[in-house]
Amino acid sequence: PEPPTACREKQYLINSQCCSLCQPGQKLVSDCTEFTETECLPCGESEFLDTWNRETHCHQHKYCDPNLGLRVQQKGTSETDTICTCEEGWHCTSEACESCVLHRSCSPGFGVKQIATGVSDTICEPCPVGFFSNVSSAFEKCHPWTSCETKDLVVQQAGTNKTDVVCGPQDRLRA
């Protein structure tokens, strides 16, 4: 056979020869020859390779460092890396999730629009007219003002975005 200039998918060219790449989860031990196939070995414990490859070393699984607020979301295999996420109340600082920060709280006058997850922070929104939030919280939404009318009461003090209305008894008409 004539020496090839290009190789098929899942092959690589070396010494004018097409050799098979190692499958995911295995690393290259020795290139193929005219007499032998590519020699590959499975990655060790806590190692992985996620593509068809000619790597001589497997990659180490990511370490989810609890000191950085991280925990394992999905354990790595010989073909996949470990996926980290953050402890309850924390979220990742980047897509790679290499460290965590405490979820942000929404200040008084703001309510939670979207509760934080392991990968996204709390999203706050200002309380619109008719709603209020009087606490700093990572969970509480804006609450609607109390409806004095339904309680047969009248508004004694108007509500704000930080305070509820104050209801009081209606003034009796004197005879």
Epitope: P1, T33, F35, T36
Partner: antibody, heavy 117, light 107 residues
Framework: EVKLVESGGGLVKPGASLKLSCAAS????????ISWVRQTSDKRLEWVAS????????YYPDNVKGRFTISRENAKNTLYLQMSSLKSEDTALYYC??????????WGQGTSVTVSS | DIVLTQSPVTLSVTPGDSVSLSCRAS??????LHWYQQKSHESPRLLIK???QSISGIPSRFSGSGSGTDFTLSINSVETEDFGIYFC?????????FGAGTKLELK
């Protein structure tokens, strides 16, 4: 028609040397790796040596390394096996075989080597 | 070294029988295994490559299967010309090694 013809076998004493040849025809010799394989009297096959198509890479099992040398002359379409420090356990029928897609796709008829005092 | 164990050592059959010859590797070799046939007073000839790929000029009654460590050569309806020794050979890593062979003989 692919043809491989071995020659050079014979009866030698332990410690002696012998050079085997394999004449190839019917294919582009310089495009193929070639191996030597031997067959003992109990019919077992044992790989002895291999050489790449260009002659730049050679391979041996541990039991013949340092004693046997495989070589080729592409201009003459000929393969060689220089054997030295021969032992009685080297007694066998020696075949040359062409490597096609990593398989020994064509074999010669063999040449007999006997090592005995 | 990768050791190839062939079984049975001898198989006595009648023409027309269908048979299976086994070759087991001491470690995984994917599909990096060839089968050879050697008739009496002849050189070996390639029968099956890469565990299951057929060879031009070899009758279709010969087929191979298996991957990893366990391989099988099947002969569908043995003919008299099939008697001889069958060898498996691995090319997964150096040194190249052969099985000790299975002798197919007339019952």
């Amino acid at each position: 028609e692919v043809k491989l013809v071995e020659s050079g076998g014979g009866l030698v004493k332990p410690g002696a040397s012998l050079k085997l040849s394999c004449a190839a025809s019917g294919f582009t010799f310089s495009n193929y790796g070639i191996s030597w394989v031997r067959q003992t009297s109990d019919k077992r096959l044992e790989w002895v040596a291999s050489i790449s198509s260009g002659g730049d890479n050679t391979y041996y099992p541990d039991n013949v390394k340092g004693r046997f040398t495989i070589s080729r002359e592409n201009a003459k379409n000929t393969l060689y096996l220089q054997m030295s420090s021969l032992k009685s356990e080297d007694t066998a029928l020696y075949y040359c075989a062409r490597a096609g897609e990593k398989a020994m796709d064509y074999w010669g008829q063999g040449t007999s080597v006997t090592v005995s005092s | 070294d990768i050791v190839l164990t062939q079984s049975p050592v001898t198989l006595s059959v009648t023409p027309g029988d269908s048979v299976s010859l086994s070759c087991r590797a001491s470690q995984t070799i994917n599909n990096n295994l060839h089968w050879y046939q050697q008739k009496s007073h002849e050189s070996p000839r390639l029968l099956i490559k890469y565990a299951s790929q057929s060879i031009s000029g070899i009758p279709s009654r010969f087929s191979g299967s298996g991957s990893g460590t366990d391989f099988t050569l099947s002969i569908n309806s043995v003919e008299t010309e099939d008697f001889g020794i069958y060898f498996c050979q691995q090319f997964s890593s150096w040194p190249l090694t052969f099985g000790a062979g299975t002798k197919l003989e007339l019952k």
